[in-house]
C-alpha cells in the first residue's frame, strides 16, 4: 500500500510538512496493493531493462507513463511505458510526450493555436502541501515556447513542470499536482538514493534551484542514516 | 461544457448503505482529481473524500473513514460514493466536485467545479 | 487538522457598498485558498483561486488577497445577485478545510 511505501521511503523522514503533521491526520490514503516497488532500480542496465512497476505516471521517467502493457488488461499491474508521440492515441494529457496533450484520443501539438480556445480540459492530481517533492522529478520540461495558455502561479493545477510561472516546479500535491515554488539554499530538500526509488510521495518538494543541490547538512553527518537532513546547498 | 450529475440519494436508515454515483461529461475524465464534499442542512460545507485521477490514491475525512469508499471507472466516465454503516450525521446533500486544469484560463485550480448534489437522509 | 476560521459569520449591507470578508487559518497555508459563492438550493461556485487569482466568468468587483494565515475576499461595490453565502476552502494540508461561511444578506 501507500503507507508501506512511505515508511520503506525517505519521505518518511521530513519533518512534518507546513501543511499538517507527518501522518497527515484527517486522511487515510491507499494505494493499488503490491506494485510499488522504492527501493527498485528503474534502469538496471541497458542490456538488462526491466519493465517498471507504477502506480500513477509520477513513478515514471519525463518520457513515460504508467499503464497496463496489454489492452484491456488487468489494471493492478502496471508499468511504465513509452509516451506517445503526436497524432497517436491516448486517454489522458499524461500518455502524450513532453510538448503534447490528449485532445479527442489524440496527442496533439500543445503549441497549436487551438490552445486559445477554451479545449479540451487536462490532468490533475492536485492537492497541497508544500512540503513534499521529488529531487529533480519534475524537471520534465519543455513543452514549445510558442505556448498561447497563461503559465500556472503558485497552487494552480499542473501536468508538467513546464506549466508553471518561472521559479515555480510542478509537484505532487495529495490527489493532484500544483505548481510549487522551486527551493532555495538553506530549505529541506528531498534525496533520492536511486532512480525510482520515491514510489507514490502524497506530496513532493521541488528540486533545489539553479547553482544549488540537495546535500546532507553538516551537522547533521554524525546522525543515523535514517535521519539525515538534506538541504540545499552551493555546488 | 463540463457537467457533473449526482445521483442515488435518498431515504435511507441508520445503519444502512447508499452508493452516489456522479457521470460527467465535456471533458476527459481520466485526466482530473475528483471529490466528493457534503452540506449538512443549513451548515457549511464539509470535504469527504477525494480520489487521484487513476483511482490508485484515496483519501477520506475521519468522520467517513472505515464506512465510506471511493472509486472511479474511468471508461464510464462515473465518480462513485459507497456509503455503509449510515448515521444519521451523514445526512446531507453530496456534491461532487473535479479539479481545474492547467489548461484553463486561467491556468485551474483544485474543486473548481461541482455538480448540483443529491440529497441523503440518514432517518429511522 | 487546519482550522479556518472566517468572519464575520453574517454581515448586512446595501448595493453598492463595499464588502469585506476575512479568513485565517490556524497555521500558514502560504496561498492554497479558495473563495467559493454559494446561493441557496445551488452549488457552490469558485470565485477565487490560489488567495488572488479570479476566475474566468468572474465579475472583476470581487478580488481576494493574502498569504499566510490571512486572507481577504472584498467586493468593491455589491450587487443584488452578490447576496449569498461565501466560503474560504484550505487546500495546503490534508484534510482540506472550509470556513463556516459569511452570509452578505440585504440590509
Known amino acids: 500500500t501507500l503507507n508501506s511505501v512511505l515508511n520503506s521511503n525517505a519521505i518518511k523522514n521530513l519533518p512534518p510538512p507546513l501543511g499538517g503533521a507527518a501522518g497527515h491526520p484527517g486522511s487515510a490514503v491507499s494505494a493499488a496493493p503490491g506494485i510499488l516497488y522504492p527501493g527498485g532500480n528503474k534502469y538496471q542496465t541497458i542490456d538488462n531493462y526491466q519493465p517498471y512497476p507504477c502506480a500513477e505516471d509520477e513513478e515514471c521517467g519525463t518520457d513515460e507513463y504508467c499503464a497496463s502493457p496489454t489492452r484491456g488488461g488487468d489494471a493492478g499491474v502496471q508499468i511504465c511505458l513509452a509516451c506517445r508521440k503526436r497524432r497517436k492515441r491516448c486517454m489522458r494529457h499524461a500518455m502524450c510526450c513532453p510538448g503534447n496533450y490528449c485532445k479527442n484520443g489524440i496527442c496533439v501539438s500543445s503549441d497549436q493555436n487551438h490552445f486559445r480556445g477554451e479545449i479540451e480540459e487536462t490532468i490533475t492530481e492536485s492537492f497541497g502541501n508544500d512540503h513534499s517533492t521529488l529531487d529533480g522529478y519534475s524537471r520534465r520540461t519543455t513543452l514549445s515556447s510558442k505556448m498561447y495558455h497563461t503559465k500556472g502561479q503558485e497552487g494552480s493545477v499542473c501536468l508538467r513542470s513546464s506549466d508553471c510561472a518561472s521559479g515555480l516546479c510542478c509537484a505532487r500535491h495529495f490527489w493532484s499536482k500544483i505548481c510549487k515554488p522551486v527551493l532555495k539554499e538553506g530549505q529541506v530538500c528531498t534525496k533520492h538514493r536511486r532512480k525510482g526509488s520515491h514510489g507514490l510521495e502524497i506530496f513532493q518538494r521541488c528540486y533545489c534551484g539553479e547553482g544549488l543541490s540537495c546535500r546532507i547538512q553538516k551537522d547533521h553527518h554524525q546522525a543515523s542514516n535514517s535521519s539525515r537532513l538534506h538541504t540545499c546547498q552551493r555546488h | 461544457q463540463v457537467q457533473l450529475v449526482e445521483s442515488g440519494g435518498g431515504l435511507v436508515q441508520p445503519g444502512g448503505s447508499l452508493r452516489l454515483s456522479c457521470a460527467a461529461s465535456?471533458?476527459?475524465?481520466?485526466?482530473?482529481?475528483l471529490h466528493w464534499v457534503r452540506q449538512a442542512p443549513g451548515k457549511g460545507l464539509e470535504w469527504v473524500s477525494s480520489i487521484s485521477y487513476y483511482g490508485s490514491s484515496t483519501y477520506y475525512a475521519d468522520s467517513v473513514k472505515g464506512r465510506f469508499t471511493i472509486s472511479r471507472d474511468n471508461s464510464k466516465n462515473t465518480l462513485y460514493l459507497q456509503m455503509n454503516s449510515l448515521r444519521a450525521e451523514d445526512t446531507a446533500v453530496y456534491y461532487c466536485?473535479?479539479?481545474?486544469?492547467?489548461?484553463?484560463?486561467?491556468?485551474?485550480?483544485?474543486?473548481?467545479?461541482w455538480g448540483q448534489g443529491t440529497l441523503v437522509t440518514v432517518s429511522s | 487538522d487546519i482550522q479556518m476560521t472566517q468572519s464575520p459569520s453574517s454581515l448586512s449591507a446595501s448595493v453598492g457598498d463595499r464588502v469585506t470578508i476575512t479568513c485565517r487559518a490556524s497555521?500558514?497555508?502560504?496561498?492554497?485558498l479558495n473563495w467559493y459563492q454559494q446561493k441557496p438550493g445551488k452549488a457552490p461556485k469558485l470565485l477565487i483561486g490560489a488567495a488572488s487569482s479570479l476566475q474566468s466568468g468572474v465579475p472583476s468587483r470581487f478580488s481576494g488577497s493574502g498569504s499566510g494565515t490571512d486572507f481577504t475576499l472584498t467586493i468593491s461595490s455589491l450587487q443584488p445577485e452578490d447576496f449569498a453565502t461565501y466560503y474560504c476552502l484550505q487546500y495546503y494540508g490534508m484534510p482540506p478545510t472550509f470556513g463556516q461561511g459569511t452570509k452578505v444578506e440585504i440590509k
Open positions: 497555521q500558514g497555508i502560504k496561498n492554497y
Open positions: 466536485a473535479r479539479d481545474g486544469s492547467h489548461m484553463d484560463k486561467p491556468p485551474g485550480y483544485v474543486f473548481a467545479f
Open positions: 465535456g471533458f476527459t475524465f481520466s485526466n482530473y482529481g
